[in-house]
């Protein structure tokens, strides 16, 4: 029950996170005009990954797309790439995780397959979240650098009494949306990975029964367990408890976590 809840919650959190990453990527307010020097500007500028906008005194907002690909800064291209990779990985992760959900029955899908799919989607969510956080952080770093550079050049070109103020940009709402969304996707991915641990099929634990055959005393245990106590020579290079995903072969070779109480 706890595993299903963890997996379901992980899925929902990741879903919200990826929706947020998509929203942030599409938003125009990645950078907004810093109003410190001109708090009463009638012309307000803000920029996104795909276009820049100007809101005028009339209340009208005009947005123009970046119609060039080669003329854009490499950093902006990198941020775009990171956000798109994050969205794509997240979307694939969501698709995989839908089929991995314990509450959804699809044919005769093995629990081990669901566990693998849960782990795969979890890893995808983690990478997706990291991509979004990295993309937003790169953009934020670019803004901070440009902000201080433009501050240093603030009053260059001052001709006598005439004041020419350079437009500076600060963090826009999309950056905060991106950071939060990336974090949520990351958390959702971790939850999926945690859920995977409990999803691996567990054997029905029968107590070992001794059958006395003529001249031999051999202990048998259903399910092909060898050296049920875990002290046999075949276990010397293996962990008794594995926290990660198990392959179908490994599931047969390891003691169940309920063997030791």
């Amino acid at each position: 029950m706890a595993v299903t809840a963890c997996q379901g919650l992980g899925f929902v959190v990741s879903l919200i996170g990826i929706a947020g990453i998509i929203a942030a990527t599409c938003m125009d307010q990645w950078s907004t005009q810093d109003l410190y020097n001109n708090p009463v500007t009638a012309v307000f500028n803000y920029q996104g990954l795909w276009r820049s906008c100007v809101r005028e005194s009339s209340g009208f907002t005009e947005c123009r797309g970046y119609f060039t690909l080669l003329g854009l800064p490499a950093m902006l291209q990198a941020v775009r790439a990171l956000m798109i990779v994050g969205i794509v990985l997240g979307a694939i992760g969501l698709l995989v995780s839908i089929f991995a959900l314990k509450c959804i029955r699809i044919g005769s899908m093995e629990d081990s397959a669901k566990a693998n799919m849960t782990l795969t989607s979890g890893i995808m969510f983690i990478v997706s979240g990291l991509c979004a956080i990295a993309g937003v952080s790169v953009f934020a770093n670019m803004l901070v650098t440009n902000f201080w550079m433009s501050t240093a050049n603030m009053y260059t070109g001052m001709g006598g009494m005439v004041q020419t103020v350079q437009t500076r940009y600060t963090f826009g709402a999309a950056l905060f949306v991106g950071w939060v969304a990336g974090g949520l996707t990351l958390i959702g991915g971790v939850m999926m990975c945690i859920a995977c641990r409990g999803l691996a099929p567990e054997e029905t634990n029968y107590k070992a029964v001794s059958y006395h055959a003529s001249g031999h005393s051999v202990a048998y245990k259903p399910g092909g367990f060898k050296a049920s106590t875990g002290f046999g020579s075949n276990t010397k290079n293996k962990k008794i408890y594995d926290g990660g995903a198990r392959t179908e072969d490994e599931v047969q070779s390891y003691p169940s976590k309920h063997d030791y109480v």
């Epitope: 009463v40 009208f60 437009t167």
Partner: antibody
Framework: QVQLVQSGAEVKKPGASVKVSCKAS????????MHWVRQAPGQRLEWMGY????????SYNQKFQGRVTITVDTSASTAYMELSSLRSEDTAVYYC????????WGQGTTVTVSS | DIQMTQSPSSLSASVGDRVTITCRSS????????????LTWYQQKPGKAPKLLIY???TRESGVPSRFSGSGSGTDFTLTISSLQPEDFATYYC?????????FGGGTKLEIK
Amino acid sequence: QVQLVQSGAEVKKPGASVKVSCKASGYTFTDYNMHWVRQAPGQRLEWMGYINPNNGGTSYNQKFQGRVTITVDTSASTAYMELSSLRSEDTAVYYCVTTRYLAVWGQGTTVTVSS
Amino acid sequence: DIQMTQSPSSLSASVGDRVTITCRSSQSLFNSGNQKNYLTWYQQKPGKAPKLLIYWASTRESGVPSRFSGSGSGTDFTLTISSLQPEDFATYYCQNDYSYPLTFGGGTKLEIK
């Protein structure tokens, strides 16, 4: 076509208040801010403030701060400008202005402040 | 506040003349966000509301005759009427549309010589 129709001329006593209305038609009222500009006889045009009909957000010229209040009734596509504590120097023609580039002006409302 | 200074305050000209009105702002009206200068020119006739002629310093409003042209950038702007027509005799105002409070020039009264 886009049109702004203002209320009629007003004569007020010093210390009184005046409320001028401006009815908009021919465009979506909430698409543009509504500005108010006045012109005293023989003087330059003077911006008083504006209102964003979407959220009721306002910005006023510091010169009129505390005396001017701009409001809107979006259901009636009408903007209002109220100026209180009237003085003789407030005698002017008051205009409402809207659309992009502030292209459309009302016909003007003459407010006379006289004792 | 941005101060707008217009010159001359009045001028006399004849029909067919080329007229230039200048406007200077105390701060730059150039917006780097869209590379536009937020200066507007209006024409006002006695007893009438101002009429928009030019926005963004040089873009003519639709319906405005081509004899009206605007130029300039930053803090210095000009309005030129290439060949004066009888209906052009009026008062012309420049306006800062870049920063609140929006401010207007003192006006240039164009009279018949």
